[in-house]
Every structure is written in C-alpha cells, then in structure tokens.
Interface confidence: low
C-alpha cells in the first residue's frame, strides 16, 4: 500500500482540515514553546506544499517521508536554539535518529503559564471575529501543555469547543450557557491527555507486548461476544493506531484510527450489540463513541475456564506451541467473563499464570504441578478489592476534601523526597477516585477505581522520571506496569528520610489568601500539609489535623478582618509557632 | 469480519476416507495455531488436531493417530484434515476453531460414517 507521495496521500485521506489541525497538534507538541503565530506559519507552509503534491505526485520533495518534511520545516525555526537549548541539536541528525530526538524533548510539565479564561464576552468577540484562528489557538494551548495528548481526539474536543460557542455566544445568559460547557471539556480533556499518557508510557516503556495484552483485556471486557481471532485484530489496528500516534506520528494515526472506525462499524455483528448507535455518528464523534462504548453483555452459556486451562492434559503442550497466542487467548477467556476486573488485576492474573506454566511445565509432574493454578489467584483478586472497599468507606467517611488530604499525608510520608507540587497535584488526582468510582455498583467499582489509579500514578511516574529523587519511586515505575499501584500501596513510611528543615517561609501567608477560589484555597493548604509531613514525617493523624484545623480557623479569622494583611502579618507567626510546639 | 466455513463433509462407508477444508478470512491466519474440534450427537466437543501457524508442529488425539493429517495453506488462508479409514465412532459435526479452543465459533461440517 505505498504511494508516491505520503504527504498527498495524508491529505486526500484527512481533507485540508483535518490535516491543518493535526499539523499544527503534531507542531505544537514537539516545540511546546514556540509562539503560536510560528506555528501557523509553519503550518501553512506545509499545507501549500502538501496541495502542490496533490496535484503532481513527482513534484520536488513530494517523495519524502514525513518525519523528513516535518522535521525540515521544524528546523528552520530560527530561535531554536536559543528557546530549546540542546533540543537543537537534534536538528543535525538524520531521520528517524532525528524525530527519536525530538520525541525525547517532549516535556510533560513544560513551564507554561496557566490558561486563564478571559471574561465571557471577550471570548464571544474572539469567536466571532475569527473562528478559525481561534480554534487554531486552542488547538495550540492544549497540545503544547499536553505533548501526549490523543491528536485525533482533540480534533473531536475542538469540534465540541466550537459548538459550545456557536451555541453560547447567542444565548441570553452566555455565562451560564457557555461556562459549564467549558469546565467539562477542561475535566473531560485532562482525564483524556492522562489516559493517553499511560498508552504512550505503557507502549515506550514496556514495549508493544505489554500494550497488547492491556487491549486484549480491555476488548475482551467490552466486546465479550466476538471471537478471540475478532478481538486480535482489533488489538492488532489499535496497537498500530497508538504507536503511531505515540510517536508524532499524526496523519497515519489519524487515518488508520479512521479505517478502524470504519471496519468495526461494518463489521458490528461479530463485534458488539452496542456499537449501533456510534456508527450513525460523523467520524470524531464516532471514534470517541466507539472507545468509550459500553461492556456487551456476556453470552449467557460461557463454559468454565478450568477445563482448557486446568484440567486439560494438553496445557503445557500448547503453551509451548505458540506461548503468547495461548497466553492471549487466556487473558480474553478471563477477561469477557470478568467485567468487574480491573484491566491491570487481569493482567496480574495472566502473568501469575504465565509464571505457573514456565515452572510447572518444567517439572516432573506438569498437571499435578498446575492443578491448583486458580486457587492462587484469590490473594491477587482480595487485594484490591479489599483497597476499594476501604479507601470508599473512607471517602464515605470523609469527603473529598479531607480524603484528598489523607492520601497526601500517607504518600508524602511513602516519598516524601518527591517534590510538594508534584505530591499535591497527584494527591489530589488520587482522591478524586472517590467520587468517580465509589458511588458507582460493587461490579463497577474495581474496574473504575484500579484503572483509574494506573493512570494518576503513570503521571507521578512520568513527572518523577524527569527529576528522579526517589529510589522507590523509580522501582515501583519501572519494575513492572501492572504492579505499579500494588507497588505504591505497599510503600510504608520511609525511615531513611531526613525530615526537612523548618522554613517560616512556607508557612507565611498573605491577603491574597482571600481572593483566591475554593480550589486555589485548598491547594494552598494542601501544599502547606505536605510541607508539615515533610518536617514532621512521623507526626501522627490527629497533631496533623488539629494543625490543619487551627489554619483553617486562621485564614478564615483573617479574611473576615478589615485590615486583612495585618491580620495575616500579626496572626501568621503566632500560628507556626503553636504548629510547632503541636508537632514537637 | 472473523469466518470459518467448512467443507467436504458427507456420508462415506466404514474404512473410506475424507478431506474436510475450512476456508478463514477477516484476521491474519498466518499468524495463529488452528485445530479441528468435532461434536457427536449428544457428546460435549472433543479436540481432534492441531496445527501450528507455520504448519511445522502437528498434534492429534490418540483415537484419530495414524489416520488423520492436519495441514494448511497460508497463502489460501485454508486449513485441511485427511480422514483415512473413517470408522463408525468418527462420525460427528467437524469445525476448525483458531488457536486451540474448544468452542464453536463456525456452523461445521457433518461426517457420517455408516454401511
């Protein structure tokens, strides 16, 4: 299926449109820095050129790979230098040494100032006087911040912009129309760039086997009905679609997304039942649809899985035979009968058998060696369903305020050389679990809560992986993917941990305190019971929350004051002294 | 979309023989193990043999051992089984299933062995 020009090819399949944007995510998530109207030019270029090889195949240049195209035009960026330091050297090697290296520049926490959102009616105007280019710039704001970010996926989050504010800007109150639109869409796209972070990481880090057997359970569980060489395939395009993908590689993973799109909705029968209503969709609304698509049900006569996998006289035999195909067809045998599994508990379950067959198959007795195989996997399934059910009754217990304030202390004192942004920021991603999962039904609770943790702690692994300062936390990220989350739960406090000095300075507060939003209020907070945990790391739970307490009762004392910032200057001193003495 | 469609059943004397094809599409055949699984009237389904992806490595059940062989045709994304000296207890519906499981994912083809 090669073509004389990929470029030409890319653009007949995608349309201008879609093109353009995915040239611009692809460009502003390798130069994150770059100012937005570089970007558009850069763009620009490439789509004039892209419409001359549309029209003459044999046209100058026409033939190059993409990478050398896109990679050409990144480099005649004149600042690179200067901005990106050594990410410009990358700019004397050749493909695909060239694009490896701009993919490692890729910088998950780049130093970019917060999108503040400006008044209402001035984002009206700004819509309405150029829709394009406002679109084009939320494009650029969130694929620069977001290096990782699913790229035909945020084609589908600036569909649902755009229709947010074509539909707002003419409502009668455009705030209350408009701003919940655009909460949604900032939640609903972090929790997507976080997700899409751990595919890449799972994909980079542990390699295309790894991300497979993730697929197969994951499929397995959606699509419970279809053939195990059905789900394969599906696996099989998906690996590709996120490779591709993963590694800046837009246009083909846009369109191979696109042909499987195309294949499961023509192919729905030996699929899933629940497809139906996704294939009526256009196409961003139905590759969205389709990932995020409900469990089937399960065939109601699914025989038990011993009797192939236990019982059977033959198991070593074809273990041997083809391990990896024997392996999957396990996991998608375990996973369609199991949708209340967590995707990462299946995996465990699949690599504990795995582990049993290479000893047992060994042995003098193989069958008398693996007979009691499934007995073994009820430790790994109690563990966290155990978790789930205590961290919820916990949430129940607490809210999610002081619940978020629970896992800060425990993680803090787990790692607490990891850095007081970095331990609130995935602290309170952590405790969010509970009111995403815990009210949800016991069966939907596991999945939900386990999946979910994967994810925040990838982003801990990921942060961490650019400033490494804990051991541990290196070992549990890159030891073994499905056992991360086991791995964190199991840390204890670390007592090799000299605690921090005491630094007045972090805990001196201003009037500005008062004017912040309830979230910005409780980070502030936040930070400061991190700094405390990291003074005191083996103060107990009640010195730590009758110190919370009394600054709680502090700023709100202050913020009620006329003179507020001599409320703050008089009243701050008086509050680190008795938090010291408290925590002596 | 996953098929398998088998063929080349029929009705044949005690001692006569039988090539049984299944003609796959919609996944990459190449790349799995296959089997053929047979069902008598009234029994549970029971592995018959089994072929590797690269049709190196054949397996087969002691009850058809010396009288059955399992082949296959990557570029035709078609599996086979010879059946020589059929006898009266090989009648069955036969189905070819990827890798080597046991349940039924295609409609089958009858054998019926009988004077």
């Known amino acids: 299926d090669t073509h004389k020009s990929e470029v030409a090819h890319r653009f007949k399949d995608l349309g201008e449109e879609h093109f353009k944007g995915l040239v611009l995510v692809a460009f502003s998530q390798y130069l994150q820095q770059c100012p937005f109207e570089e970007h558009v030019k850069l763009v620009n270029e490439v789509t004039e050129f892209a419409k001359t090889c549309v029209a003459d195949e044999s046209a100058e240049n026409c033939d190059k790979s993409l990478h050398t195209l896109f990679g050409d035009k990144l480099c005649t960026v004149a600042t690179l230098r200067e901005t990106y330091g050594e990410m410009a050297d990358c700019c004397a090697k050749q493909e695909p040494e060239r694009n490896e290296c701009f993919l490692q520049h890729k910088d998950d926490n780049p130093n970019l100032p917060p999108l503040v959102r400006p008044e209402v009616d001035v984002m009206c105007t700004a819509f309405h006087d150029n829709e394009a280019t406002f679109l084009k710039k939320y494009l650029y704001e969130v694929a620069r911040r977001h290096p990782y970010f699913y790229a035909p996926e945020l084609l589908f989050f600036a569909a649902r912009y755009k229709a947010a504010f074509a539909e707002c800007c003419q409502a009668a109150d455009k705030a209350a129309c408009l701003l919940p639109k655009l909460d949604e869409l900032r939640d609903e796209g972090k929790a997507s760039s976080a997700k899409q972070r751990l595919k890449c990481a799972s994909l980079q880090k542990f390699g295309d086997r790894a991300f497979k057997a993730w697929a197969v359970a994951r499929l397995s569980q959606k699509f419970p009905k279809a053939e195990f060489a059905e789900v394969s395939k599906l696996v099989t395009d998906l690996t590709k679609v996120h490779t591709e993908c993963c590694h800046g590689d837009l246009l083909e993973c846009a369109d191979d997304r696109a042909d499987l799109a195309k294949y499961m909705c023509e192919n729905q029968d030996s699929i899933s039942s629940k497809l139906k209503e996704c294939c009526d969709k256009p196409l961003l609304e139905k590759s969205h649809c389709l990932a995020e698509v409900e469990n089937d049900e399960m065939p109601a006569d699914l025989p038990s899985l011993a009797a192939d996998y236990v019982e059977s006289k033959d198991v070593c035999k074809n273990y041997a035979e083809a391990k990896d195909v024997f392996l999957g067809m396990f996991l998608y045998e375990y996973a369609r009968r199991h949708p209340d599994y967590s995707v990462m508990l299946l995996l465990r379950l699949a690599k504990a058998y795995e582990a049993t067959l290479e000893k047992c198959c060994a042995a003098a007795d193989p069958h008398e060696c693996y007979a009691k195989v499934f007995d073994e996997f009820q430790p790994l399934v109690e563990e966290p369903q155990n978790l789930v059910k205590q961290n919820c009754e916990l949430f129940e217990q607490l809210g999610e305020y002081k619940f978020q304030n629970a896992l800060l202390v425990r993680y803090t004192k787990k790692v607490p050389q990891v850095s007081t942004p970095t331990l609130v920021e995935v602290s309170r991603n952590l405790g969010k679990v509970g009111a995403k999962c815990c009210k949800l039904p016991e069966a939907k609770r596991m999945p939900c809560a386990e999946d979910y943790l994967s994810v925040v702690l990838n982003r801990l692994c990921v942060l961490h992986e650019k400033t490494p300062v804990s051991e541990k936390v290196t070992k549990c990220c890159t030891e073994s993917l499905v056992n991360r989350r086991p791995c964190f739960s199991a840390l204890e406090l670390d007592e090799a941990y000299v605690p921090k000095a005491f630094n007045a300075e972090t805990f001196t507060f201003h009037a500005d305190m008062c004017t912040l939003s309830e979230k910005e209020k409780q980070v502030k907070k936040q930070t400061a019971l991190v700094e405390l945990v990291k003074h005191k790391p083996k103060a107990t739970k009640e010195q730590l929350k009758g110190v919370m307490d009394n600054f709680a009762a502090f700023v709100e004392k202050c913020c009620k004051a006329d003179d507020k910032e001599a409320c703050f200057a008089e009243e701050g001193p008086k509050f680190v002294a008795a938090s010291q003495a408290a925590l002596a | 979309q996953v098929q398998l469609v088998e063929s080349g059943g029929g009705l044949v004397q005690p001692g006569g023989s039988l090539r049984l094809s299944c003609a796959a599409s919609g996944f990459t055949f190449g790349s799995f193990g296959m089997s053929w699984v047979r069902q008598a009237p009234g029994k549970g389904p029971e592995w018959v043999s089994a072929?590797?992806?690269?049709?190196?490595?054949?397996r087969y059940a002691e009850t058809v051992k010396g009288r059955f062989t399992i082949s296959r045709d990557n570029l035709k994304k078609t599996l086979y089984l010879q059946m020589n000296s059929l006898k009266p207890e090989d009648t069955a519906v036969y189905y070819c299933?990827?890798?080597?499981?046991?349940?039924?994912g295609s409609q089958g083809t009858q054998v019926t062995v009988s004077s």
């Open positions: 299933t990827i890798g080597r499981s046991t349940s039924r």
């Open positions: 072929i590797d992806s690269g049709g190196a490595d054949t």
